[in-house]
Interface confidence: low
């Protein structure tokens, strides 16, 4: 039943070309190249992709042709290293080309930039987009893949093909509609928001694999799949976990053709065996490939089997606990995690992993004790505080969210996190705190039983964004510590951080708080970001400012913006009233 055990192929590139088809092959190679060389112009990438595709076709025709036996890493790496401007554009990344495989590919992976210096994507007018779409549909869609891939170098490639398919469908439908904008813009907004979420979720998977290893990823997958498929047997879940780990290892490692091919095989296997996996898969399995894979990944949890026995019998009361643990530690812990997770769809995956870790630590200690059973008899009691901590935190924060609304809730988190880690750059603090704040509208609407898996697993994704951005330019040993010590304890680690008493406040710089009339033409979201940027800077200047002081200054600031945006001579208003506001704020904060 091993889905991925294939016969050896004389030509790997021919094999993948035949499996995937020309369209998907070209799209995946474009994504791979754009994720590696994030600064290269679109036209250069298209040229490289066309050259690789032509070569692949010669190998399909004759697998024994020259170079067809080379690995995909060798073929793609050689192609990337032909880029003339590699040294000027990418600096030291060009040194990768002096290495041999597999070191060369590892080198390219290390140079992927989570925050590339690229201009913000500005959406053209609807008519302009529709004209471009009709003039050259293929180029238009390739451009979409290229722009997303270079800005999100860990985007899950087969899923990006699904997004591109929806993107194409939106333009096909809406460019014929009477009101093109009303039809298209909501669809593009939805794709943008879903795309950002998808990118962030995949970034956590890759961080888990790359920073904490395959064991950490497999543990996550056991917990999540056991919640989703509680009727499936442990052996079935283990098989799915092994296959899923292979798929994500490949995608995170830049092996996008293998990843897409293996993901398709996994979807096929799941659908062929849905009777022994889940009753919720029927609709998914009737869809075409890309939609099918996406649907399976998002499928709701199946119902828990009735009358599941108590966990204590096998994992606490049994005299064979230490024997079973000693014989195959990871299998026994995997079974514990599977059994616990399938009974608790109401827990977050990270909580389940903390419980499994506590269980493992207890067995390590107790199985070496004089009376192991007496030692581990109360292990489940140790779980209580671990479960209550996220429950209480979510309860408090949902109450705060309901009281404040999203924008002010984000502001409360901005202040909280700036005081915890004031060394982190202002744009990062704003981005991360805004995303943390979205947990309110995303999860607090759910009933208790769904709040924790929604909230804490979402927070894990957002805090991973902080971790990967901070890793590029480490500025805070507290962030480094929370990000690197334990994947599952990142959120509790950040929650436990108090105000950083060692932080030396930033010197006051009036320029930071100087605003111009251009703020009046910004969208509401962009205006919020401006105000939130000012709030972070205020806290960096005055970390001991009280909530009341900050609220007063921010209220004054909002009134100032509103007043000057209504003025006839906006620029003069911003200049004159701005000086007064800065002076008043300094006085209010005692700067």
């Amino acid at each position: 039943r091993g889905v991925f055990r294939r016969d050896a192929h004389k030509s790997e590139v021919a094999h993948r070309f035949k499996d995937l088809g020309e369209e998907n092959f070209k799209a995946l190679v474009l994504i791979a190249f754009a994720q590696y060389l994030q600064q290269c112009p679109f036209e250069d990438h298209v040229k490289l992709v066309n050259e690789v595709t032509e070569f692949a076709k010669t190998c399909v025709a004759d697998e024994s042709a020259e170079n067809c036996d080379k690995s995909l890493h060798t073929l793609f790496g050689d192609k990337l290293c032909t880029v003339a401007t590699l040294r000027e554009t990418y600096g030291e990344m060009a040194d990768c080309c002096a290495k041999q495989e597999p070191e060369r590919n590892e080198c390219f992976l290390q140079h992927k930039d989570d925050n590339p210096n690229l201009p913000r994507l500005v959406r053209p007018e609807v008519d302009v987009m529709c004209t471009a779409f009709h003039d050259n549909e293929e180029t238009f869609l390739k451009k979409y893949l290229y722009e997303i891939a270079r800005r999100h170098p860990y985007f899950y490639a087969p899923e990006l093909l699904f997004f591109a398919k929806r993107y194409k469908a939106a333009f096909t439908e809406c460019c014929q509609a009477a009101d093109k904008a009303a039809c298209l813009l909501p669809k593009l907004d939805e794709l943008r928001d879903e795309g950002k979420a998808s990118s962030a979720k995949q970034r956590l998977k890759c961080a888990s694999l790359q920073k904490f290893g395959e064991r950490a990823f497999k543990a996550w997958a056991v917990a999540r799949l056991s919640q989703r498929f509680p009727k499936a047997e442990f052996a079935e879940v283990s098989k799915l976990v092994t296959d899923l780990t292979k798929v994500h290892t490949e995608c995170c490692h830049g092996d996008l053709l293998e990843c897409a091919d293996d993901r398709a095989d996994l979807a096929k296997y799941i659908c062929e065996n849905q009777d022994s996996i889940s009753s919720k898969l029927k609709e998914c399995c009737e869809k075409p490939l890309l939609e099918k894979s996406h649907c399976i990944a998002e499928v709701e949890n199946d119902e828990m089997p009735a009358d599941l026995p108590s966990l204590a019998a096998d994992f606490v009361e049994s005299k064979d606990v230490c024997k079973n643990y000693a014989e195959a530690k990871d299998v026994f812990l995997g079974m514990f995690l599977y059994e616990y997770a399938r009974r608790h769809p109401d827990y977050s995956v990270v909580l389940l992993l903390r419980l499994a870790k506590t269980y493992e630590t207890t067995l390590e200690k107790c199985c070496a004790a004089a009376d192991p059973h007496e030692c581990y008899a109360k292990v489940f009691d140790e779980f209580k505080p671990l479960v209550e901590e996220p429950q209480n935190l979510i309860k408090q924060n949902c109450e705060l969210f309901e009281q404040l609304g999203e924008y002010k809730f984000q502001n409360a988190l901005l202040v909280r996190y700036t005081k915890k880690v004031p060394q982190v750059s202002t744009p990062t603090l704003v981005e991360v705190s805004r995303n943390l704040g979205k947990v309110g509208s995303k999860c607090c609407k759910h009933p208790e039983a769904k709040r924790m898996p929604c909230a804490e697993d979402y927070l894990s994704v957002v805090l991973n964004q902080l971790c990967v951005l901070h890793e590029k330019t480490p500025v805070s040993d507290r962030v480094t510590k929370c990000c690197t010590e334990s994947l599952v304890n990142r959120r509790p680690c950040f929650s436990a951080l108090e105000v950083d008493e060692t932080y030396v406040p930033k010197e006051f710089n009036a320029e930071t708080f100087t605003f111009h009339a251009d703020i009046c033409t910004l969208s509401e979201k962009e205006r919020q970001i401006k105000k939130q940027t000012a709030l972070v800077e205020l806290v960096k200047h005055k970390p001991k400012a009280t909530k009341e002081q900050l609220k007063a200054v921010m209220d004054d600031f909002a009134a100032f913006v509103e007043k000057c945006c209504k003025a006839d001579d906006k620029e003069t208003c911003f200049a004159e009233e701005g000086k007064k506001l800065v002076a008043a704020s300094q006085a209010a904060l005692g700067l």
């Epitope: 210096n117 750059s425 590029k472 690197t484």
Partner: antibody, heavy 119, light 111 residues
Framework: EVQLVQSGAEVKKPGESLKISCKGS????????IGWVRQMPGEGLEWMGI????????RYSPSFEGQVTISADKSISTAYLQWNSLKASDTAMYYC????????????WGQGTLVTVSS | QSALTQPASVSGSPGQSITISCSGI?????????VSWYQQYPGKAPKLIIY???KRPSGVSNRFSGSKSGNTASLTISGLQADDEAEYSC???????????FGGGTQLTVL
Amino acid sequence: EVQLVQSGAEVKKPGESLKISCKGSGYSFTNYWIGWVRQMPGEGLEWMGIIYPGDSDTRYSPSFEGQVTISADKSISTAYLQWNSLKASDTAMYYCARLHGVVSRGDYWGQGTLVTVSS
Amino acid sequence: QSALTQPASVSGSPGQSITISCSGISSLAGSYNLVSWYQQYPGKAPKLIIYEVTKRPSGVSNRFSGSKSGNTASLTISGLQADDEAEYSCSSYAGRNAVAVFGGGTQLTVL
């Protein structure tokens, strides 16, 4: 190719001010920290402080806090180290280095600027 | 006064191996392997030879290797050559203000 080129040697009197420079080229100057290192005659190396030219975020080692000022002008890819009032004990060779992250390695170094302070 | 302690000098004959120690690595620097080694010839700028405890920049001979045990990092030079004679300094993240510190430096003499 990555290069850090420092300004030439300086001979100054105690109490005078001085600003030495370090110009980066061959890489994205705003994306890497620049560190300044002092080496007094016959002595070891000492990290003085670091700056991130992208946003001018600056950190000083405790023993150099208040003694020197580190700054940068990203428009000309140049970092600076300055003294308002030199002392004889500031006589040393000063190096700038490009850093990978705050806490990591200095992979490219300037050639050094010799500062001599003597009455 | 440096927070990292190195021997003032070590010596060895051509072909031998020598090890230079660097003690006082903070637990944070140790956990995340934030230790570098630099080689410096008289009148020249330092050159990075080891980073993140064990890694060598491209172009640095594999005769240079790094390791760490507890709060002590070590630099080993095998197959000693005359042009290895130089000053060697370790550097580590200090945690305070996120600025690194250097060891006092070790003068290597090739006999």
